[in-house]
Amino acid sequence: DWVVAPISVPENGKGPFPQRLNQLKSNKDRDTKIFYSITGPGADSPPEGVFAVEKETGWLLLNKPLDREEIAKYELYGHAVSENGASVEEPMNISIIVTDQNDNKPKFTQDTFRGSVLEGVLPGTSVMQVTATDEDDAIYTYNGVVAYSIHSQEPKDPHDLMFTIHRSTGTISVISSGLDREKVPEYTLTIQATDMDGDGSTTTAVAVVEILDANDNAPMFDPQKYEAHVPENAVGHEVQRLTVTDLDAPNSPAWRATYLIMGGDDGDHFTITTHPESNQGILTTRKGLDFEAKNQHTLYVEVTNEAPFVLKLPTSTATIVVHVEDVNEAPVFVPPSKVVEVQEGIPTGEPVCVYTAEDPDKENQKISYRILRDPAGWLAMDPDSGQVTAVGTLDREDEQFVRNNIYEVMVLAMDNGSPPTTGTGTLLLTLIDVNDHGPVPEPRQITICNQSPVRQVLNITDKDLSPHTSPFQAQLTDDSDIYWTAEVNEEGDTVVLSLKKFLKQDTYDVHLSLSDHGNKEQLTVIRATVCDCHGHVETCPGPWKGG
């Protein structure tokens, strides 16, 4: 029959070539001479000429060694024609299967594989997977079936079989306990991939297993006892640096120290922080220490890590004896800011108050006083007693020196220590108002028409405080009432000035006397410009000849 069973050809044939494979034969050759040809990739299309057929004999030839890893199967078509070129058979499929030879070694996908595993893990823990490929066939033969093995381990501590590899998956696992990063931080495994499922060609690669740090070492104080000296009152002062050693991986959470003051700091005077590089504990004062209250503190500091311990570990404790050193402390005014009410305008030499300071030091030191800042120069202070007296006129209405009725003075106390120290206090004098200012109209110049004049409304101001202000009373003096009237409004804070008789265009003085609720009287002369006009005016119209 015009059929050819699949032809198997081993790859890498040694020849000689051309090499016979099979004979194509049509049973029509009894009737006529048959010519044979083949088509398809490997015959008349790329890769051309690998196969050929003898036209008259039908012998199928192979012209070169085959490579299964390049082309594993050729699908050709055989043709049979008569002498006149007419097809005598349907094209016949010719399958040429290239059978595998073990001509490829396994190849690892990397020269060096890198993996990691936590120290102290239990046997059976997976570390990493390595992969090797083999181009040979692994379905019908074992040529491409790779088996993995570990050839060697460096170092061989604690022994030479710390890891195992799954022969078919390439998964490397821990097989023994005892992985200790602090002893062996890294293992180098020489791994093998062998084809023929372990009986063939071998290739090697390296698997580097990094042993990751676990917090299995506690930080330890070295030394465990410290003595420090700190001047009293110093805040943020570095008291002592505490040093620890930790065998875990530097700069990791398992190495970085966390310090805790366990005892001896009842007043919450101290704080401890970790230096980011040296890992030392930096003990500093959070508040100033008081030599007079307590001249020695014994602190107990415990150290742990940022990361929790992976097993129960004893914690290290340090003892720090802090000696507080006495310093000459400044006198302190009591209170630091003193408010005193005093009437403005009191006579010179009148006492204002006594303002004294206390010295925190134990020995009885002499304190002397002086005024440090007295903007208006109104006060004096007795250096021994702290008595403050008036030496100038206290004026509540002095806007340059008084704000919101308060006059602020800074005083100084100095002890007789060596060297002497000073303290300051603030004296806030609340000035009590007296009726020392009369009412004043605003504005003091007016312009008015002499025909149908508009009433002039003047505001009344008084620098004093209530009750020394409104209601105000108005009175015209010096015959000003012949031509003018002055009336205070109902609210009592404005005065209305009206022209009641015709005056020719000119400038006139209107004598206006205003008195406040406390009958403090103030005479003011209003300059009135009268214009020849009707109703409202701001400046006189026309040529002005007035003076």
């Epitope: 000689p16 051309p18 050929a52 012998w59 199928l60 030839l61 012209n63």
Partner: antibody
């Protein structure tokens, strides 16, 4: 009837070159592998070169590799052997022969003589 | 390189006599062996291929056989045109190699 006829033989000095030809007729030249075989003066036969039917692949023994080149022109039904760097031991009768039934050497020519001598 | 040892190098026989020529292969070549004859004028013709298959037009008195690595050409009854040179060629291993030849002479 399959016929092959060689030509191009002659006397050549050592180190010289020569090109042999083989004209084929009576069969479909382009579908048969072709070879050159030589017979030395002591009557020993030695395979020299083979070329596949399409001319894509060539084969040589070590003794001539790099010096001899077999080629073919299927349009002209002609086989060639380019010989260079000739040595005295290349002196022989050179035959062209066809594969037949997929094996050597079904049909032979009459041969052409090559003499390498100074 | 595979060596073909052909024996005898020459053989004298009478007309009508039967003779056998032998080639021994130094390595396995399977059935991949042909027998050739060379006329006195230098003409070469293939007689047998694949150890025992007769080429078309070759008389039936010629036959080929194999015993292990020994390959034989047998002429059952010699005729006058048979007294020529005979060669074996193996094509089972590269390179192709010939036997040294046997000269068959008339006694």
């Amino acid at each position: 009837v399959q016929l092959v006829e060689e030509s191009g033989g002659g006397l050549v000095k050592p180190g010289g070159s020569l090109k042999l030809s083989c004209a084929a007729s009576g069969f479909t030249f382009s579908s048969y592998a072709m070879s050159w075989v030589r017979q030395t003066p002591d009557k020993r036969l030695e395979w020299v070169a083979t070329i596949s039917s399409g001319g894509h692949y060539t084969y040589y023994p070590d003794s001539v590799k790099g010096r001899f080149t077999i080629s073919r022109d299927n349009a002209k039904n002609t086989l060639y052997l380019q010989m260079s760097s000739l040595k005295s031991e290349d002196t022989a009768m050179y035959y062209c022969a066809s594969y037949y039934y997929g094996i050597p050497f079904g049909y032979w020519g009459q041969g052409t003589t090559v003499t390498v001598s100074s | 390189e595979l060596v073909m040892t052909q024996s005898p190098s020459s053989l004298s026989a009478s007309l009508g006599e039967g003779v056998s020529l032998t080639c021994r292969a130094s390595q396995d070549i399977g059935i991949n062996l042909i027998w050739l004859r060379q006329e006195p004028d230098g003409t070469i013709k293939r007689l047998i291929y694949d150890t025992s298959s007769l080429d078309s037009g070759v008389p039936k008195r010629f036959s080929g056989s194999r015993s292990g690595s020994d390959y034989s050409l047998t002429i059952s009854s010699l005729e006058s045109e048979d007294f020529v040179h005979y060669y074996c060629l193996q094509y089972g291993s590269s390179p192709l190699t010939f036997g040294a030849g046997t000269k068959l002479e008339i006694k």
